[in-house]
């Protein structure tokens, strides 16, 4: 279970048009689930019922964006659908580059994508808990756009690794 | 195509045990939760309970949670349901069904009777 | 628990016609509304899920509608393999509860 190092980046744009962007460094786990790879794109917030579409003729995203998915307490999910193995793997059928799943309210979901490994996803599912997930979670839930980087190495310099 | 396979009806004597299974194919067992759902004759339908085939984590609802136990095989992609201490209450038909509950196997009748 | 009530209990029609059965939650489920059909062997099959979304393969005869605690299945136009059983399911709340059905009977 490699260290995932995740660069996030928020765009606030201004009223002028110009945009800052600020960078937030965080760290999570390469799941078993997937693959240790470096990955990015523009973060897409999915909520756990929403990868349990049942009709199977769902619309998919564009290509390359990554699933930030915020897990439930398991015990007071009212429709389970999709276990943590199935939602990232939905994910990916869906155009996800990865995966990170905040499992700070699900701690059982860690075990859960480590014994995936028969089959593991080509992408990277990464897990994060506690202040990192705090701190993805509150970029996320800002609802502005905002890239996420995924490496399995320290990151230099943040302005190495995204095409502004 | 998704498919559950249930196993054929059972006549039980009141206090014994049964085990009824459900077979699935079609996808990967371990994508999905795995629900169950009793139906007494001429009644509606009422939610037992669910296995995550991942680790074999269940919740069932308070009625249930010491008549039914719930399990899962990943080797064989089937999953069991166990109803101990029968009574004529238990008789019903029960229901399998993948999570999101899209696909349903056909039912297993219980009977208890001595 | 949310209680589902189902009305009515029995709903005698004819070929062609259209008819609308109702679900009445206890309390607000948000859209967390579907729609079930049991044939006359036992078989479930879904026709509808969160409140107005028809499963795959479900004709476009069949619809559904509403908010807050009232909810509704529309069939436009009866067809002979219709005249069956009716269940409408929440899944806002744990434990998931189940309408106690409706029987749609040729009149």
């Known amino acids: 279970k490699e260290t995932a190092f995740v660069e996030v980046v928020l765009f606030e744009s201004s009223p002028s048009g110009d945009y800052t962007t600020y960078t937030t460094g965080l760290t999570g786990r390469f799941s078993r689930a997937g693959a240790t790879l470096s990955a990015e794109g523009e973060i897409v917030q999915m909520h756990p019922l929403g990868l349990c579409n049942n009709n199977d003729e769902e619309d998919l995203y564009e290509y390359g964006w990554v699933g930030v998915v915020k897990l439930e307490q398991p015990e007071l999910d009212p429709k389970p659908c999709l276990t943590v193995l199935g939602k990232a793997k939905r994910a990916v059928q869906r155009g996800a580059t990865a995966v990170i799943f905040d499992v700070s309210e699900n701690p059982e979901a860690i075990d859960q994508l480590n014994q995936g490994s028969e089959d593991p996803l080509k992408r990277p599912v990464v897990y994060v808990k506690g202040a990192d997930a705090i701190k993805l979670m509150n970029i996320v839930n800002k609802q502005k756009v905002a890239r996420a980087r995924i490496q399995h190495r320290p990151p230099r310099q943040p302005t190495e690794y995204f095409d502004m | 195509e998704v498919l559950l396979q249930q196993s054929g009806a059972e006549l039980v004597r009141p206090g014994s045990s049964v085990k009824i299974s459900c077979k699935t194919s079609?996808?990967?067992?371990?994508?999905?939760?795995l629900h169950w759902v009793k139906q007494r004759p001429e009644q509606g339908l009422v939610w037992i309970g669910r296995i995550n085939p991942i680790n074999g984590k269940t919740v069932c609802i308070e009625k249930f949670k010491t008549k039914a136990t719930l399990t899962a095989d990943k080797s064989s992609n089937t999953a069991y349901m166990e109803l101990s201490s029968l009574t004529s209450e238990d008789t019903a038909t029960y229901f399998c069904?993948?999570?999101?509950?899209?696909?349903w196997g056909q039912g297993t009748l219980v009977t208890v009777s001595s | 628990d949310i209680q589902m009530t189902q009305s009515p209990s029995s709903l005698p029609a004819s070929l062609g016609e259209r008819v609308t059965i109702s679900c009445r939650a206890s309390q607000g489920i948000s859209n967390n509304l579907n729609w079930y059909q049991q044939k006359p062997d036992g078989t479930i099959k879904p026709l509808i899920y969160?409140?107005?979304n028809l499963q795959s393969g479900v004709p476009s005869r069949f619809s559904g509608s509403g908010s807050g605690t009232d909810y509704s299945l529309t069939i436009g136009s009866l067809e002979p393999e219709d005249f069956t059983m009716y269940y409408c399911q929440q899944d806002a709340s744990f434990p998931p509860t189940f309408g106690a059905g409706t029987k749609l009977e040729l009149k």
């Open positions: 069904t993948r999570g999101g509950l899209a696909y």
């Open positions: 969160y409140t107005s």
């Open positions: 079609g996808y990967t067992f371990t994508d999905y939760y």
